[in-house]
């Protein structure tokens, strides 16, 4: 029949070339000559001449060794004709099958493999892949097949078996205890990839394990114990620098510590901060120590880290002894601000009050007192013991000085340390109210028509407080009454003024006396322009003049 | 001489609540993961649970995890195993086992818990 | 996980040789040259008598030796004596769990 099987040829043959493959024969050769071809790729279309046929025997030849790598298998089509070219049989299919030799060794995808894994894990944990490859069957031979192992492991601490391999896939997993980064930090492995499932040719790559930190140390404070000097009063002020070590890896939250003050801070004066670069412990003061109240005070501060800890870690402590220096200290006004109420108008030489200063400092310093503002120059105060005294008149109504009936006054203390300090104080005077405003009237001009004149009202205002002020009394004083009269409202806050008879355009004095409730007598002169008109006018009219 | 001893185990009610502990001996402790294996009456060995040298990483059997807890003192060379929510399934002879190359090294005689009502 | 396979029992005569398979995946008896067999008398804890598939740990007879082929692993016992009747399991380190995987074990039946 004109059919051939499958033909099966091993890459890489040695020849002799060409080499006789198979014999295409037709059974129409019984009755005429017959011319053999073959077509294709591999015949005569790339890559050409790989195969030939002889035209008359019908023998496929093989002219060249084969790659199963670069092709596996060739599709070819036979032909016979007749000698006059006709063609005596359909065309065949002829398969030649490239069969496998291992001629080629397993590759590692790359030279060196990065991997990682956290310190202290388990047997069992993976930690990276490593692949490689081979060009050569890995379906119907084992030529292709790679099997993993590990060849070596540097260094060989705490053993030299701390990691094991996939032999088919190529996982690296750990398979010992006692991965500690903190004494083996990286483990760089030999791998090796062997074709024939690890009956043939082998390479090898290197794996690089890089063992990641665990907070599997705790920080521990060197030195443990500690003595600072801090001088009464300091705010902010840094006390003492705690040091700690930690094995884990720096910088890294498993390292970077974490203080806490346990005891021994019982009025809440101390805080302790990380140092960002060298991770000691910043003490310093959050409030001012007392070296009057406690010289001395003992800390307890405890040391963690950032991140917690990956186990039960026993945490160092650290004692800080804390020596309060004395200082001297100003003086303090008792109260810092001081009110005090006294009448305005007190003769010169009248005492206003006492006002002293304590000295926090345990010795008997002497204290010296003074005033160092006094706006008006109303006051006086005794250096040794700090009696104020009025020497000038306390004006409750001096606008200048005095805000919402307080006149405020600073004194300073001073003691005899070396170097002496002072302490202020303020002094807030309430000026009481005395009766020594009269009332006064507003405006004190007033223009007026002579025809049907219109009422003139005056705001009436007193300086003084109440109740020296309304009600008010109005009276004409200097026969002011005989043109005029004078009215005091219902609310007694205004006085009205008419003028009862007539007089020519002129300019008048209208003398009014006002009193207030507490008799409080004040005498105005109001000016007053009358003008040749009728009823309301704000200025007098000129001279009418007719055409 | 490398010594594991077991104890703690007992009679217990489902959803109760047993603490075992294994003292270790002979060995150092700390070097080594450690297991608790067990064994049900008449049946073959099951894994429960690991912790490594250090107590960092632990590790679970599907049928006992949220229930048991693994824990270790290195301090006092002590291996412990919380168990609550029993159940009668937990039944076994419990061994506690120090991890060589690959295999449970050495063994403890095991400690017996019983869940029943 | 599944659990190695292993015949449930295996007998043999006093001075004979017996082998007990333990049969398990590429992803564990195939993959690792980490397979160990523990002895267990009856009431007792089990004890190493192989590791890494054929490594005695000290102590142990030479009669027990160990070998394996692809997915399978082998403890031979030659020489049999009534000792070595007891209950043998066989455990692989394996992938994407930690620790070992048990097989279900061999009653050894020494006739």
């Known amino acids: 029949d004109w059919v051939v099987a499958p033909i099966s040829v091993p890459e890489n043959g040695k020849g002799p070339f060409p080499q006789r493959l198979n014999q295409l024969k037709s059974n129409k050769d019984r009755d005429t000559k017959i011319f053999y071809s073959i077509t294709g790729p591999g015949a005569d279309s790339p890559p050409e001449g790989v195969f030939a046929v002889e035209k008359e025997t019908g023998w496929l030849l093989l002219n060249k060794p084969l790659d199963r790598e670069e092709i596996a298998k060739y599709e070819l089509f036979g032909h016979a004709v007749s000698e006059n070219g006709a063609s005596v049989e359909d065309p065949m299919n002829i398969s030649i099958i490239v069969t496998d030799q291992n001629d080629h060794k397993p590759k590692f995808t790359q030279d060196t493999f990065r991997g990682s894994v956290l310190e202290g894990v388990l047997p069992g944990t993976s930690v990276m892949q490593v692949t490689a490859t081979d060009e050569d069957d890995a379906i119907y031979t084992y030529n292709g097949v790679v099997a993993y192992s590990i060849h070596s492991q540097e260094p060989k601490d705490p053993h030299d078996l701390m990691f094991t391999i996939h032999r088919s896939t190529g996982t690296i997993s750990v398979i010992s205890s006692g991965l500690d980064r903190e004494k083996v930090p990286e483990y760089t492995l030999t791998i090796q990839a062997t074709d024939m499932d690890g009956d043939g040719s082998t390479t090898t790559a290197v794996a690089v394990v890089e063992i990641l930190d665990a907070n599997d140390n705790a920080p521990m404070f060197d030195p443990q114990k500690y003595e600072a000097h801090v001088p009464e009063n300091a705010v902010g002020h840094e006390v003492q620098r705690l040091t700690v070590t930690d094995l884990d890896a720096p910088n890294s939250p498993a390292w970077r510590a974490t203080y806490l003050i346990m005891g021994g801070d019982d009025g809440d004066h101390f805080t302790i901060t990380t140092h960002p670069e060298s991770n000691q412990g910043i003490l310093t003061t959050r409030k001012g120590l007392d070296f009057e109240a406690k010289n001395q005070h003992t800390l307890y501060v405890e040391v963690t880290n950032e991140a917690p800890f990956v186990l039960k870690l026993p945490t160092s402590t650290a004692t800080i002894v804390v020596h309060v220096e004395d200082v001297n200290e100003a003086p303090v006004f008792v109260p810092p601000s001081k009110v005090v109420e006294v009448q305005e108008g007190i003769p010169t030489g009248e005492p206003v009050c006492v006002y002293t200063a304590e000295d926090p400092d345990k010795e008997n310093q002497k204290i010296s007192y003074r005033i160092l503002r006094d706006p008006a120059g109303w006051l006086a105060m005794d250096p040794d013991s700090g009696q104020v005294t009025a020497v000038g008149t306390l004006d409750r109504e001096d606008e200048q000085f005095v805000r919402n009936n307080i006149y405020e006054v600073m004194v300073l203390a001073m003691d005899n340390g070396s170097p002496p300090t002072t302490g202020t104080g303020t002094l807030l005077l309430t000026l009481i109210d005395v009766n020594d405003h009269g009332p006064v009237p507003e405006p004190r001009q007033i223009t007026i028509c002579n025809q049907s004149p219109v009422r003139q009202v005056l705001n009436i205002t007193d300086k003084d407080l109440s109740p020296h002020t309304s009600p008010f009394q109005a009276q004409l004083t200097d026969d002011s009454d005989i043109y005029w009269t004078a009215e005091v409202n219902e609310e007694g806050d205004t006085v009205v003024l008419s003028l009862k008879k007539f007089l020519k355009q002129d300019t008048y004095d209208v003398h009014l006396s006002l009193s207030d409730h507490g008799n409080k007598e004040q005498l105005t002169v109001i000016r007053a322009t009358v003008c040749d008109c009728h009823g309301h006018v704000e200025t007098c009219p000129g001279p009418w003049k007719g055409g | 001489e490398v010594q594991l001893l077991e104890s703690g185990g007992g009679l217990v009610q489902p959803g109760g609540s047993l603490r075992l502990s294994c003292a270790a001996s002979g060995f150092t402790f700390s070097s080594y993961a450690m297991s608790w294996v067990r064994q049900a009456p008449g049946k073959g060995l099951e894994w429960v649970s690991a912790i490594s040298g250090s107590g960092g990483s632990t590790y679970y059997a599907d049928s006992v995890k949220g229930r048991f807890t693994i824990s270790r003192d290195n301090s006092k060379n002590t291996l412990y195993l919380q168990m609550n929510s029993l159940r009668a399934e937990d039944t076994a002879v419990y061994y506690c086992?120090?991890?060589?190359?690959?295999?449970?090294?050495?063994w403890g005689q095991g400690t017996m818990v019983t869940v029943s009502s | 996980q599944s659990a190695l396979t292993q015949p449930a029992s295996v007998s043999g005569s006093p001075g004979q040789s017996i082998t007990i398979s333990c049969t398990g995946t590429?992803?564990?008896?195939?993959?690792?040259?980490?397979v160990s067999w523990y002895q267990q008398h009856p009431g007792k804890a089990p004890k190493l008598i192989l590791s890494?598939?054929?490594k005695r740990p000290s102590g142990v007879s030479n009669r027990f030796s160990g070998s394996k082929s692809g997915n399978t692993a082998s403890l031979s016992i030659s020489g049999l004596q009534a000792e070595d009747e007891a209950d043998y399991y066989c455990?692989?380190?394996?992938?994407?769990?930690?620790?070992?995987?048990f097989g279900g074990g061999t009653k050894l039946t020494v006739l």
């Open positions: 455990s692989s380190f394996t992938s994407g769990i930690v620790f070992n995987l």
């Open positions: 890494e598939v054929n």
């Open positions: 590429s992803n564990d008896v195939g993959a690792y040259n980490y």
């Open positions: 086992a120090s991890w060589g190359l690959g295999s449970n090294e050495n």
